[in-house]
Interface confidence: medium
């Protein structure tokens, strides 16, 4: 492993569309892939009138935007669907929205996924 890199071997899995996609609704997903590729965890969610609605969580393919991120943080300002990715086992258990704004001070909104992860 590259020095300082946090290897991702498994991620929290969740799929709101699990029945149609023929998957489990929630669980732990092992992350497979070529040995020369980095693997990440991700989370996507919506904010419906202040209520967090998780869309999907799981493993994510090698993506430079996820490199060396130990926390799953969305930095875009008010996206329609929030997305974050990270490196490290189960790093997508918690995710947060931390918009990068020029003037106002950023505020963190950590989210604990529901339903909770289980083996």
């Amino acid at each position: 492993a590259i020095l300082g890199r946090s290897e991702t071997q498994e991620c929290l899995f969740f799929n709101a569309n699990w029945e149609k996609d023929r998957t489990n609704q929630t669980g732990v997903e092992p992350c497979y892939g070529d040995k020369d590729k980095r693997r990440h965890c991700f989370a996507t969610w919506k904010n419906i009138s202040g209520s967090i609605e998780i869309v999907k969580q799981g493993c994510w393919l090698d993506d430079i935007n996820c490199y060396d991120r130990t926390d799953c943080v969305e930095k875009k300002d008010s996206p329609e669907v929030y997305f974050c990715c990270c490196e490290g086992n189960m790093c997508n258990e918690k995710f947060s929205y931390f918009p990068e704004m020029e003037v106002t001070q950023p505020t963190s909104n950590p989210v604990t996924p529901k339903p909770p992860y289980y083996n």
């Epitope: 996609d21 497979y32 393919l61």
Partner: antibody, heavy 120, light 107 residues
Framework: EVQLLESGGGLVQPGGSLRLSCAAS????????MHWVRQAPGKGLEWVAS????????GYADSVKGRFTISRDNSKNTLYLQMNSLRAEDTAVYYC?????????????WGQGTLVTVSS | DIQMTQSPSSLSASVGDRVTITCRAS??????LNWYQQKPGKAPKLLIY???SRASGVPSRFSGSGSGTDFTLTISSLQPEDFATYYC?????????FGGGTKVEIK
């Protein structure tokens, strides 16, 4: 080197059956979900079916549901597509392709394809 | 099913040109969008996955952008070997669906 080699294509009459195989090498086969994608002559790509690493999940296009069955034998590093009740519109080149996860469906390696012709 | 609409269906360009192909999904697919290149008589080849990430061995002149419903594949400087048909594909939901393809021809 990753290799996927399809076989089993050929000419078959409407209503007939064929079994396609895809022999995989150069990677750990049972780490990957596998897919069949087809392409009718002069047309675009159409997803046909997929199966996850341990055969726990399978998915089919509506156009083949109930007629085609996807399966795999991890001990033989081989993917299969059993095609029954074939129709003229099933005529196509059939490709097998791999994907890292069930929902991570970027198809990063493809076979060269095998041609299935359904005609009387 | 999620419909994928690609445009244009064909285009003529010269070596060195900047080429842009667009793909629109009928509903949000987050970043689950992949691009493939196919040459006559050959299997498709993965170019871009997760909307923006280049696959192994793909030249840097190929880039992808977009999220949600609108996506773009850009070839910054067209090379002779780039004349081919390009397909987008969504992998957000089953069934997986492809765009109709964009044929890039020599002007």
């Amino acid at each position: 080197e990753v290799q996927l080699l399809e076989s089993g294509g050929g000419l078959v009459q409407p209503g007939g059956s064929l079994r396609l195989s895809c022999a995989a090498s150069g990677f750990t086969f049972d780490d990957y979900s596998m897919h069949w994608v087809r392409q009718a002559p002069g047309k675009g790509l159409e997803w046909v079916a997929s199966i996850n690493y341990n055969s726990g999940y399978k998915g089919y296009a509506d156009s083949v549901k109930g007629r085609f069955t996807i399966s795999r034998d991890n001990s033989k590093n081989t993917l299969y597509l059993q095609m029954n009740s074939l129709r003229a519109e099933d005529t196509a080149v059939y490709y097998c392709a791999r994907a890292a996860n069930w929902h991570d469906t970027a198809l990063d390696y493809w076979g060269q394809g095998t041609l299935v012709t359904v005609s009387s | 099913d999620i419909q994928m609409t690609q445009s244009p269906s064909s285009l003529s360009a010269s070596v060195g040109d900047r080429v842009t192909i667009t793909c629109r999904a009928s509903q949000s697919i987050l970043r689950y969008l992949n691009w493939y290149q196919q040459k006559p008589g050959k299997a498709p080849k993965l170019l871009i996955y997760a909307a923006t990430s280049r696959a192994s061995g793909v030249p840097s002149r190929f880039s992808g952008s977009g999220s949600g419903t609108d996506f773009t594949l850009t070839i910054s400087s067209l090379q002779p070997e780039d004349f081919a048909t390009y397909y987008c594909q969504q992998s957000d939901n089953l069934p997986l669906t492809f765009g109709g393809g964009t044929k890039v021809e020599i002007k």
